[in-house]
């Protein structure tokens, strides 16, 4: 799995999307877990409704919410009031029995509030910004910014 970076600003909300094959994962509940370090286990943060048919209902654990569009094949996680210690590696998972398939590996990056740090360089709208593959950054939005190109709007 590549690791997709989602960037959010401290104090704001961040929405993470995990697309998946709706037919392959039909009937399966989903979960959002936080990985301990680069190679540690993934600790469950929140999971979708116990009844798969009600997966569209938003479920909260603290400031983290999860909702699943089972027809469209998109799992959405919302991190409300993003804080520095929310930064880290996460996974979107598809559950079957006691097993879990990884739908997407996510790096949540927390940026300083530009109102607190007006010296921020090249600050753009946060959102899904880049992917890492085998520890190498692919040429994507943030690399474009780094090379002085015009930033794209955030993906939705």
């Amino acid at each position: 799995h590549n690791t997709t970076v989602f960037q959010g600003v401290a104090g704001q909300s961040l929405q993470v999307s995990c697309p998946y094959d709706s037919m392959k994962h039909w009937g399966r509940r989903k979960a959002w877990c936080r990985q301990l370090g680069e190679k540690g286990p993934c600790q469950r943060v929140v999971s979708t409704h116990n009844l798969w048919l009600l997966s569209f209902l938003r479920r909260w654990n603290g400031s983290t919410a999860i909702t699943d569009d089972t027809l469209g094949g998109t799992l959405t996680i919302t991190l409300r009031n993003l804080q520095p210690h929310d930064a880290g590696l996460y996974q979107c998972q598809s559950l079957h029995g006691s097993e879990a398939d990884t739908l997407r590996k996510v790096l949540v990056e927390v940026l300083a509030d530009p109102l607190d740090h007006r010296d921020a360089g090249d600050l753009w709208f946060p959102g899904e910004s880049e992917s890492f593959e085998d520890a190498h950054v692919e040429h994507s939005i943030s690399r474009s910014l780094l090379e002085g190109e015009i930033p794209f709007p955030p993906t939705s």
Epitope: A87, L89, L107, V110, A135, R143
Partner: antibody, heavy 120, light 106 residues
């Protein structure tokens, strides 16, 4: 084992430039925010600049803004600090510091530092 | 940016003593405070982050506490290898270090 090795320090005249490098190993460099922190001789620690994982967001202390540029090469696992228009008050040991995964708010590992002396 | 004042700047203690170091912010820090240890000629080492979270590999005799503007690093029983300078560091608004507390043997 996490390693951060700084290089590029030395004696430089006021107004001149210097570029510091920090070679990182033992971790997935592109997952971590990075920073430079300095320490003048016999003085305390002073944050200088930070950079996001992809390099698109940079932050500087007021006294170096417009003179210093932090950057990173994720393919080379290297952090840089370009220092222009150097002043005597920039004399310090410069430490490369690794943030945590996805952030450079606090620093979990530090290099051994490289000494920059600005003097005529 | 928030200013941090550490006290005392120099503290003399004996091995086995319970040692308390103080750090005060010019405004609220919201628990976004870390403590670093720096021995002579060495790079700083992270001890505590987010006020009271112990960094991996740091002995449990180190602990942090506090809220608002006032924070404390406590060494429950001083070891000789703990003699060093300790810096508090806030990352709530900007990034600033305190002036340091040098811990020496009495």
């Amino acid at each position: 084992e996490v390693q951060l090795v700084e290089s590029g320090g030395g004696l430089v005249q006021p107004g001149k430039s210097l570029k510091l490098s920090c070679a990182a190993s033992g971790f997935t460099f592109s997952y971590y925010g990075m920073a430079w922190v300095r320490q003048a001789p016999t003085k305390g620690l002073e944050w200088v600049a930070s950079i996001s994982t992809g390099g698109g967001n940079t932050y500087y202390r007021d006294s170096v803004k417009g003179r210093f540029t932090i950057s990173r090469g994720n393919a080379k696992n290297t952090l840089y600090l370009q220092m222009d228009s150097l002043r005597s008050e920039d004399t310090a040991t410069y430490y490369c510091a690794r943030g945590d995964i996805g952030t450079s708010y606090w620093f979990t590992y530090w290099g051994q530092g490289t000494l920059v002396t600005v003097s005529s | 940016d928030i200013q941090l004042t550490q006290s005392p700047s120099l503290l003399s203690a004996s091995v086995g003593d319970r040692v308390t170091l103080s750090c005060k912010g010019s405004q609220t820090i919201n628990n976004y405070l870390a403590w670093y240890q720096q021995k002579l000629g060495e790079a700083p080492k992270l001890l505590i982050y987010k006020t009271n979270s112990l960094q991996t590999g740091i002995p449990s005799r180190f602990s942090g506490s506090g809220s608002g503007t006032d924070y404390t690093l406590t060494i429950s029983s001083l070891h000789s290898e703990d003699l060093a300078t300790y810096y508090c560091y806030q990352y709530n608004n900007g990034w600033t270090f305190g002036g340091g507390t040098k811990l020496e043997l009495k």
